[in-house]
């Protein structure tokens, strides 16, 4: 088996909760400057299942701002520009990792958290339940 | 901006890179009480802009497996079940946070990384460029 050698360049943790509490470098690699999804594409307006983007802000979370999609209609926009209720606009959801300050208000202590966010909407054929 | 008051119960950080390097409790808290709602919809098949899910695997990243959506068609599925090329299937993208070991193999040192993933597809009206 492989034994991982103790890397002398590793930060040392004397924390009694180790290995659950670790050091995380927040100097994000791949920092895409464009965090507002409205700026990256206008699909939210051009979609047949258009959505509004709501700003979800929480100073106790990292990232503090997350954009949540809310479908504008129950149905989908047809070729005439009208809402067709034979189809459904539904949110596409994604589970993401965030950091939450724990204990609250601590500037350098966080807990890893999974949250579910709505990223956009898509138009689907409804599931028809036939009554027996 | 919001100034976070110093909580006397906070872990102290003497790290010279503070606040970029923080302590994180990796005992993941899942806010999604109904287990894994992210996994429970079949919208990828029922959408008018259906997509396939492709596995993006990286054993040195958490999560190790991320699913990437790829739209099945350039156009969208119409009421007859045919592909209508007057409309476009496009991917909805989202930036997500992942954890990477840094330096590699250090048991208690991580770095946050942002990656862009395609979560699903939506059907949009194409942008028509008129030639002057």
């Amino acid at each position: 088996g492989i034994t991982i050698p103790r890397n002398p360049g590793c930060p040392n943790s004397e924390d009694k909760n180790f290995p659950r509490t670790v050091m995380v470098n927040l100097n994000i690699h791949n920092r895409n400057t464009n965090t507002n999804p409205k700026r990256s594409s206008d699909y939210y307006n051009r979609s047949t299942s258009p959505w509004n983007l709501h700003r979800n802000e929480d100073p106790e979370r990292y990232p503090s701002v997350i954009w949540e999609a809310q479908c504008r209609h129950l149905g989908c926009i047809n070729a005439d520009g009208n809402v067709d209720y034979h189809m459904n606009s539904v949110p596409i959801q994604q589970e993401i990792l965030v950091l939450r300050r724990e204990p609250p208000h601590c500037p350098n202590s966080f807990r890893l958290e999974k949250i579910l966010v709505s990223v956009g909407c898509t138009c689907v054929t409804p599931i028809v339940h036939h009554v027996q | 901006g919001i100034t976070i008051p110093r909580n006397p119960g906070c872990p102290n950080s003497e790290d010279k890179n503070f606040p970029r390097t923080v302590m994180v409790n990796l005992n993941i808290h899942n806010r999604n009480t109904n287990t894994n709602p992210k996994r429970s919809s079949d919208y990828y098949n029922r959408s008018t802009s259906p997509w396939n899910l492709h596995r993006n695997e990286d054993p040195e990243r958490y999560p190790s497996v991320i699913w990437e959506a790829q739209c099945r068609h350039l156009g969208c599925i119409n009421a007859d079940g045919n592909v209508d090329y007057h409309m476009n299937s496009v991917p909805i993208q989202q930036e997500i946070l992942v954890l990477r070991r840094e330096p590699p193999h250090c048991p208690n040192s991580f770095r946050l990384e942002k990656i862009l993933v395609s979560v699903g597809c939506t059907c949009v009206t194409p942008i028509v460029h008129h030639v002057q």
């Epitope: 492989i2 290995p19 | 990796l26 996994r39 899910l53 070991r101």
Partner: antibody, heavy 117, light 106 residues
Framework: QVQLVQSGAEVKKPGSSVKVSCKAS????????ISWVRQAPGQGLEWMGS????????NYAQKFQGRVTITADESTSTAYMELSSLRSEDTAVYYC??????????WGQGTLVTVSS | DIQMTQSPSSLSASVGDRVTITCRAS??????LNWYQQKPGKAPKLLIY???SLQSGVPSRFSGSGSGTDFTLTISSLQPEDFAVYYC????????FGQGTKVEIK
Amino acid sequence: QVQLVQSGAEVKKPGSSVKVSCKASGGTFSSYAISWVRQAPGQGLEWMGSIIPWFGYTNYAQKFQGRVTITADESTSTAYMELSSLRSEDTAVYYCARDSEYYFDHWGQGTLVTVSS
Amino acid sequence: DIQMTQSPSSLSASVGDRVTITCRASQGISNWLNWYQQKPGKAPKLLIYAASSLQSGVPSRFSGSGSGTDFTLTISSLQPEDFAVYYCQQYSDDPTFGQGTKVEIK
């Protein structure tokens, strides 16, 4: 190529505990979870719980909550499953498996635990 | 827990036959369904993940389909080494397995 090698067969008395090990060779644990799955003689497969060794994060099936403890030692790339208060119904082959949180793609060879007075 | 029901529980087939095993989930699980093969005295082996994706190294005669609650594993032309027990498993929630389908020689 990842290989999971488990400890040998055990015979235990009712009421006692058993601790089975699972060593990853040919690669570290990386960021995957390790799950434990058991199979009683002639029966199907039953998931018991998992651990993400990177984090020490555990998740247990409700049926085994309070009776199973899963741990991992990253320095030796070994995961452990301890089951306490053993009863005859716990006689089974216990497997460890690498878990992407979507599927189990590598399995140990299995460890037979026999509970008998 | 999500219940997984396989059918049939056993079947007899000959080499070269096309074999189909079905699996039904007690609630919608999208495409988060896997298929495993287990031979006597051996650990299970992953064949299909995410309902229809073939795990690397698995012969192309194995295929999976389905979405939501109903799924199928198909072996297009049964080979001598395919006689085994097959399990479906969901990972939409904490993992649960079907009871297994034994494929025997006719």
